[in-house]
Interface confidence: low
């Protein structure tokens, strides 16, 4: 808000107006208007010669504004010369500006028909178990005036959850300075916000408009099970669709999948509604929507609708999700060479083929840089010539490999190490 | 909106669940939940042994998730081992998750009490001189159904100027698919926006809630004098204050200062309201507010209020706003030296002292770098020794300088130039 007292100089023409005289024959005035204002209204410089005589001053467009700066980017400077025969030390000139046509508007206000009662103040919330009491006060002027009495007023309380819009807020009317909100008004475990305004009671002799809204007040509703879906609402479009929506905490929705189930009559079979559409609702909740078809509203006029966890199942076929136990691995020395031998845990089904992956490396290498061999149904592997006096490591893993069977590699066997022998010098 | 078909796997436990068996003695499952979900609900892995038998699976916390990635930053991995004696190629396991307590909500929907009629479509505006016709359509399903008839419905049209809020919008009710807005509804030269919703008529057998709002439609109202102040409104607080507000185009307010004037009865004298508070209203308008005192609402129940241009005046005292005419300047040569002489326009009042400012410079210098002298009541000045064979320039200006008189410097005199003589060589 900007404040201006009556009489404050605020227009650009008046701000920029400067008048200087030569104290002999004339007064020169300079001022500016804006291009934007000129599109809508032209103003004329007026000199008040005496109490009754206002004289328009003839002004020309000017190229410059040497005496004052213009506070607007698109100023139109003007210069005016007023002939003047006599100058006295007490002379004062009175200048103003006048629009080129009458501007203004007028209203006759009958007080009883133009009432805006005072807005509620000191809105507070207090609680008693799961009931919440909103209280406020309203200043009605001095009690002796009696012009506006409590009987002329009622109060409109609107309240909503923090994440909802005021447009969808619930309304409660009260003819006292308080209102109670109980479990029937509030969803559990939610943050609510309320505001109140004063309005004229229907039976009052007064008319006008409601007060401004009071400042808002916030509170947490009665505690409840936050994992429960809430705010299930269904509305029929009058033709063929019953549109339902409900809300779930985002964290809960990540672990429990809820579906909408319906029956067109108590003894009908339950069906699941699909597709479900989802949208975010604030940072904590997700709102779900689904449309239930209503083929015959005249016959089936009552639907039983519920939100329940869906038995969303994952089907896992045993024969293609096999992970065998890791083989047990041994290293043997046959003359000058080395062999790897392994055993798998006995499987009840001997017709299932096995694929083995064998890795071996020097102690100084990593498994990533190891040699890798793949063998089918074998249980041993002769190693090629190895470097003498070197420590080696080996490991093996297994997977099923018969058509109709599948899975993932077993864990690696426990890694085995051995040291190759040194070579005797040739002399 | 996100769309999910009934049956879509969407929860983190189901997404992350992987089960592998050794095809001999056991199945190992791994899955994850989130810490955030666990605060509100715990889920248990369920194995469906047959159509009727659901068995909970015992799972332990795990350090890792080798078989799948968790799509959440705070996952809690789990590992479960299910003993299993026989495996057949056709075996399929059915896994799901179940919350630790019954979750859900239920609603019995009587269609006649849960109606949300369809929202209006094709909202259009057409004009006939200064009247504007809003038309729309509404789809009521097949005519043969007759469940929802036009007689069950009415339409709520809300309209406002672009810069106003929907909360302060005006409402018009219509029981047909059209509404007319005339000059009595609309301010001239304004952009308006309207929207419509369908609601259940008071006499209908149906109940529920209004439709969603239609998309908005915009139009420009009948042209008018945009320089006029508009929307003058006054409301009495029922105690002692009549609060008035009005709007002015920003460009007009920059050139014309409006005031609020009031009379507590037709034959009372007019007074001006002060202070006026201002606030921006959109990009084009300024809203002004002022509070009129109402000392006796019982006696004076009707106020005449008007917005008019204020005679905001600037008072300019002649004797302290003097700008004399510039002096006329000449240069004279007295032997080897030069003098400047000037005259001022004859003033009718000889008792007023004059101060002169004299500047002179070489042709190659600028006025900023010139020599400056100030003299009181003098009309000439001898110049000091100048450089030979050089062009010089001089100028002079004047201002009044007697107590009780003031003003600004005159314009500079016309600048005069002269060339100094060359010096004869000494031989």
């Amino acid at each position: 808000w900007e404040r201006s007292l009556a009489g404050a100089e605020e227009t650009i023409p008046l701000q920029t107006l400067r008048c200087y005289n030569d104290y002999t024959s004339h007064i020169t005035c300079r001022w500016a208007d804006t291009q934007d204002a000129q599109r809508l209204v032209n103003v004329t410089l007026i000199r008040r010669v005496n109490e009754d005589l206002l004289e328009p001053v003839s002004c020309d467009l000017s190229d410059d504004m040497p005496w004052s700066a213009c506070p607007h980017p698109r100023c139109v400077p003007r210069r005016c010369v007023i002939p003047c025969q006599s100058f006295v030390v007490t002379d004062v000139d009175y200048f103003s500006f006048q629009p080129d046509r009458p501007l203004g508007t007028r209203l006759t206000v009958t007080l009883t028909q133009h009432v805006q009662p005072p807005e509620p103040r000191d809105l507070q919330i207090s609680t008693d178990q799961d009931h919440f009491l909103l209280t406020w006060s309203v200043a009605l002027g001095s009690p002796q005036s009696h012009w506006l009495s409590p009987g002329d007023l009622e109060f409109e309380v609107v309240y909503k959850r923090l994440q909802d819009s005021w447009e969808d807020a619930a309304i409660l009317l009260s003819n006292t300075s308080q209102a109670t909100l109980g479990p029937e008004h509030l969803m559990p475990s939610s943050t609510y916000v309320a505001r109140v305004r004063t309005r004229l009671a229907p039976g009052s002799r007064l008319s006008g408009r409601p007060s401004k809204w009071s400042p808002e007040v916030c509170w947490d509703s009665q505690p409840g099970d936050e994992a429960q879906p809430q705010n299930l609402e269904c509305f029929f479009d009058g033709a063929a669709v019953l549109s339902c929506s409900w809300e779930v905490r985002k964290e809960v929705a990540s672990s429990v999948s809820f579906g909408l189930f319906y029956k067109p009559s108590p003894d009908a079979g339950e069906e699941e509604c699909s597709p479900v559409l989802r949208e975010g609702l604030g940072s904590l909740h997700t709102r779900h929507h689904c449309q239930i078809p209503v083929p015959d509203p005249a016959t089936h006029g009552q639907y039983i609708v519920s939100v329940q966890p869906r038995r969303a199942e994952k089907h896992i076929k045993s024969s293609v999700n096999i992970q065998m136990a890791p083989p047990s691995l041994n290293v043997t020395k046959d003359g000058d060479s080395y062999s790897l031998r392994w055993e798998t845990m006995k499987m009840r089904y001997e017709h299932i083929d096995h694929t083995f992956e064998i890795q071996y490396r020097k102690d100084t290498a990593t498994w990533k840089d190891s040699k890798t061999e793949t063998l089918q149904n074998a249980h041993s592997m002769a190693l090629p010539a190895l470097e003498p006096s070197t420590r080696y490591w080996a490991r093996v893993r297994v997977r099923t490999s018969r058509t109709g069977y599948n899975g993932i590699w077993s864990e690696w066997s426990e890694a085995r190490s051995w040291d190759t022998e040194s070579v005797l010098p040739m002399w | 909106w996100e769309r999910s078909l009934a049956g879509a796997e969407e929860t983190i436990p189901l997404q992350t669940l992987r089960c592998y068996n050794d095809y001999t003695s056991h199945i190992t499952c791994r899955w994850a939940d989130t810490q955030d979900a666990q605060r509100l609900v715990n889920v248990t892995l369920i194995r469906r042994v047959n159509e009727d038998l659901l068995e909970p699976v015992s799972c332990d916390l795990s350090d890792d998730m080798p078989w799948s990635a968790c799509p959440h930053p705070r996952c809690v991995p789990r590992r479960c081992v299910i003993p299993c004696q026989s495996f057949v190629v056709t075996d399929v396991d059915y896994f799901s998750f179940q919350p630790d307590r019954p979750l859900g909500t239920r609603l019995t929907v009587t269609l006649t009490q849960h109606v949300q009629p369809p929202e209006p479509r094709d909202l259009q505006i057409s004009t006939d001189q200064d009247h504007f016709l809003l038309t729309w359509s509404v789809a009521l399903g097949s005519p043969q159904s007759h469940w929802l008839s036009p007689g069950d419905l009415e339409f709520e049209v809300v309209y406002k100027r672009l810069q106003d809020s929907w909360e302060d919008a005006a409402i018009l009710l219509s029981n047909t698919s059209q509404a007319t807005l005339g000059p009595e509804h609309l301010m001239p030269s304004s952009t308006y926006v309207a929207r419509v919703r369908t609601r259940l008529a008071p006499g209908s057998r149906l109940s529920g809630r209004p439709s969603k709002w239609s998309p908005e439609v915009c139009w420009d109202s009948q042209p008018g004098d945009e320089a006029q102040p508009q929307n003058l409104e006054c409301f009495f607080d029922g105690a002692a204050v009549l609060s008035c507000s009005w709007e002015v185009r920003k460009e007009v307010a920059s050139s014309v200062s409006f005031g609020l004037f009031y009379k507590p009865s037709p034959d009372a004298g007019e007074e001006e309201c002060s202070p006026v508070l201002r606030e921006g209203l959109g990009s084009l308008h300024t809203r002004h507010h002022c509070q009129i005192p109402v000392p006796d609402p019982a006696t004076h129940g009707q106020y005449i209020v008007s917005v008019q241009p204020r005679r905001a005046e600037k008072h300019i005292k002649s004797s302290v706003n003097i700008q004399m005419a510039p002096p006329s300047l000449n240069v004279t040569k007295d032997g080897d030296s030069y003098s400047l002489r000037w005259e001022t326009m004859k003033m009718r009042y000889e008792h007023i002292d004059h101060t002169f400012e004299i500047q002179y410079r070489k042709d190659t210098a600028t006025w900023k770098d010139s020599k400056t002298e100030t003299l009181q009541n003098a009309h000439s000045m001898a110049l000091p020794a100048l450089e030979p064979s050089t062009r010089y320039w001089a100028r002079v200006r004047v201002r009044t300088s007697r107590t009780g008189y003031n003003g600004i410097w005159s314009e500079w005199s016309e600048a005069r130039s002269w060339d100094t003589e060359s010096v004869l060589p000494m031989w």
């Epitope: 509170w219 505690p223 099970d225 | 605060r39």
Partner: antibody, heavy 118, light 105 residues
Framework: QVQLVESGGGLVKPGGSLRLSCAAS????????MNWIRQAPGKGLEWVSY????????YYADSVKGRFTISRDNAKNSLYLQMNSLRAEDTAVYYC???????????WGQGTTVTVSS | EIVLTQSPGTLSLSPGERATLSCRAS???????LAWYQQKPGQAPRLLIY???SRATGIPDRFSGSGSGTDFTLTISRLEPEDFAVYYC??????FGQGTKVEIK
Amino acid sequence: QVQLVESGGGLVKPGGSLRLSCAASGFTFSDYYMNWIRQAPGKGLEWVSYISTSGSIIYYADSVKGRFTISRDNAKNSLYLQMNSLRAEDTAVYYCARRRYYYGMDVWGQGTTVTVSS
Amino acid sequence: EIVLTQSPGTLSLSPGERATLSCRASQSVSSSYLAWYQQKPGQAPRLLIYGASSRATGIPDRFSGSGSGTDFTLTISRLEPEDFAVYYCQQYGRTFGQGTKVEIK
């Protein structure tokens, strides 16, 4: 592990003041409603005061209304009880306890002793 | 204000016996908001039952709660030596009953 630890108790003269603190650890403090409960020597439990998760709702037992003030600082995981105008009958062990919806007060502190005596 | 009255004031029983403790409210209480606590000398109370009938984490299944409206019951099916203590009922997370002491006969 989940823990509540009270501090600030002691001996005070009638009419004096004390400020009790309760430090929470091992759980998300801002998710829980917090309570103060007291137990006079040889007597039963008496609920004193309660504060909601965000601190927007507070209430007190009639016996302490106007004298005691409960507050919380979720950033510091702390609960407080400012006790003014203390009387002899305020002598008790003061416990802080957390409550989550209708699940009851499932975690309690070990208590701090307040003795009001001249 | 709702007043909770517990009976009996003291219950003298032997280990292995069944204990039945009563809690009566002066007006109807939502069963969702009724809880039972156990307190041993020199210790803080311990939550046993919430929502009138749900066992708190780690509470043995010999403890069970029932009731609705104004009458609620805590039952200990077979008393163990460690069960001898004082038991309190509480409503709406606020008022406590005066307590029932279960002592060894």
